[in-house]
Amino acid sequence: IWELKKDVYVVELDWYPDAPGEMVVLTCDTPEEDGITWTLDQSSEVLGSGKTLTIQVKEFGDAGQYTCHKGGEVLSHSLLLLHKKEDGIWSTDILKDQKEPKNKTFLRCEAKNYSGRFTCWWLTTISTDLTFSVKSSRGSSDPQGVTCGAATLSAERVRGDNKEYEYSVECQEDSACPAAEESLPIEVMVDAVHKLKYENYTSSFFIRDIIKPDPPKNLQLKPLKNSRQVEVSWEYPDTWSTPHSYFSLTFCVQVQGKSKREKKDRVFTDKTSATVICRKNASISVRAQDRYYSSSWSEWASVPCS
Amino acid sequence: RNLPVATPDPGMFPCLHHSQNLLRAVSNMLQKARQTLEFYPCTSEEIDHEDITKDKTSTVEACLPLELTKNESCLNSRETSFITNGSCLASRKTSFMMALCLSSIYEDLKMYQVEFKTMNAKLLMDPKRQIFLDQNMLAVIDELMQALNFNSETVPQKSSLEEPDFYKTKIKLCILLHAFRIRAVTIDRVMSYLNAS
């Protein structure tokens, strides 16, 4: 058993049929010694008396808010949560496996630039009685500071018969140099509590590996005389690290109709303009990627050909 | 130590070209190592990230773009950092800073070259003959060093009398390639910045 926060404790349980469970001793936070009784949640049934209560925690029915009273007055609370371990593996029931970029990916993180600011998000089908708390650091043995905000519900989607909820959090490394060469990864730890179930999820990464620039901005078209060709130009996204001659991007320019199966024109360039063939009912799209370290491509920025 | 915006050096563009070749060569070599050594811990997640140039060179700081010198986090990482007064430097100081930057890059390349050559000598003794260093990568390191045109004492190639541990050598190769790739990215950024300045 360990303390998650004041008056909230996590009991780690090996979860299998007829498991013996964990013996837990609760102590009432009071100077009083006599006349103390214990109850669980909203029940008025007295579980025991005395300054300490010893319980055998085996299942969720044994978890919850234990309260010690004296003469009708509440003295203190202890909330017990369960963290299940099945076949030596901690449970991951609360969050959905996003399976990208690999299986058992529960947290996904992205950074728009090298400033040390990044966003992580996760998915769940649970809509109520759900809380998250996020901590982060650079390295684990001698951790350097990363400050994370509160996790918030950022999107709701309908998937078949299910509703899916996306939560996200923004974090900022306390003293980040965009030009630095990372040797210690960022660690992100998410505590998830659903009703009386506790789970924790972690992710470890270098900012350079989670870079995904914003799409290029200000796409413009200039038809070329006596040709099917069009000159398309654009600018670096505002959120990208500066100076751009140091933090350079490379671009992919594509002309395609509405369907992915349609024919297309595609060209890669390090410049902020390119010449492509435009077709009726097609769109010109441009996306960006760090020129020197191939992490993710940005989303497409698009303009219609016509 | 930072890199102010400098007058373009006529010799800079070849360095940009060579640095691009360097990044390409080390990336290809790293990819080859990851494929060939698939049963060894050779991915970015599995290895310890070590920098053999740590406390010996200060390329990131010496080559910091002027625009980042206002960022204290970029300057306080090493006591060798050079903090400028105002945003403009006299051209003599400018070329001095650039020389510090380029000589730091040269020293990096020299250290990695020695490490890679020593390692290759060990790998050539491996009866499995599983992996060797790409001669193209070694040649590209050499070309960039020549383009930088710094003279410094030759570092003797380390020779080891004890029987090499091939497993350890291959893991060390992965560590070295990952670190060198990151440094090659920095070198490419620096050359691009200098070329544009």
Epitope: R228, E262, D270, K280 | -
Partner: antibody, heavy 118, light 107 residues
Framework: QVQLVQSGAEVKKPGSSVKVSCKAS????????LHWVRQAPGQGLEWMGW????????EYAPKFQGRVTITADESTSTAYMELSSLRSEDTAVYMC???????????WGQGTLVTVSS | DIVMTQSPLSLPVTPGEPASISCRAS??????LHWYQQKPGQAPRLLIA???QSISGVPSRFSGSGSGTDFTLTISSLQPEDFATYLC?????????FGQGTKVEIK
């Protein structure tokens, strides 16, 4: 199986024209760009131009501009390349090639040898 | 027009050995470069698109690298069927242009 089948070899006199055909099978004809590329004996490949069979749009290499005409007939899934004012240096194997991507070629025809000789 | 220069023009290789072919562009073409294999009397066959993207059905022993002006096609271990002429093609701008070809011959 996508295939491009070209017309047979031709012998032409200098100053005349030649029209080579390229019939596509497998896949929808208008879903692909169609190009013509030639290869003179012992020489490299030379790109001549492309057509979008969907709308008849064409683009030609400046070297052949004014001498080459590429057309397409959607009803027969056939593309044509006509080269006029033939010279002896136009002796080459003419190949059609296609792809959904405009700028490179994933399926080629077998080639048609055009000999220009007086 | 962008001029593509291949080297060497002829490359004698022992079967089972690796081979590397170089292609250089007269100006920077990013990764807009494609590799083809051509056997005598046959049409070219696409091997690699955009400098390094593998093509389905092409053996994994063929790989490409490079960007800007310098590109390499590598065959990790030459098989008897790999003896042929290899061509690079740029797609950075029209007109599309090809290298003159590198003939890989049995040593």
């Amino acid at each position: 199986q996508v295939q491009l089948v070209q017309s047979g070899a031709e012998v032409k006199k200098p100053g005349s024209s030649v029209k080579v055909s390229c019939k596509a099978s497998g896949g929808t004809f208008s879903d692909y760009y169609l190009h013509w590329v030639r290869q003179a004996p012992g020489q490299g490949l030379e790109w001549m131009g492309w057509i979008d069979p969907e709308n008849g749009d064409t683009e030609y290499a400046p070297k052949f501009q004014g001498r080459v005409t590429i057309t397409a007939d959607e009803s027969t899934s056939t593309a044509y390349m006509e080269l006029s004012s033939l010279r002896s240096e136009d002796t080459a194997v003419y190949m059609c090639a296609r792809n959904k991507e405009l700028r490179y070629f994933d399926v080629w025809g077998q080639g048609t040898l055009v000999t220009v000789s007086s | 027009d962008i001029v593509m220069t291949q080297s060497p023009l002829s490359l004698p290789v022992t079967p089972g050995e690796p081979a590397s072919i170089s292609c250089r562009a007269s100006q920077s073409i990013s990764i807009n470069l494609h590799w083809y294999q051509q056997k005598p009397g046959q049409a070219p066959r696409l091997l690699i698109a955009f400098a390094s993207q593998s093509i389905s059905g092409v053996p994994s022993r063929f790989s490409g690298s490079g960007s800007g002006t310098d590109f390499t096609l590598t065959i990790s271990s030459l098989q008897p069927e790999d003896f042929a002429t290899y061509l690079c093609q740029q797609s950075n701008s029209f007109p599309l242009t090809f290298g003159q070809g590198t003939k890989v011959e049995i040593k």
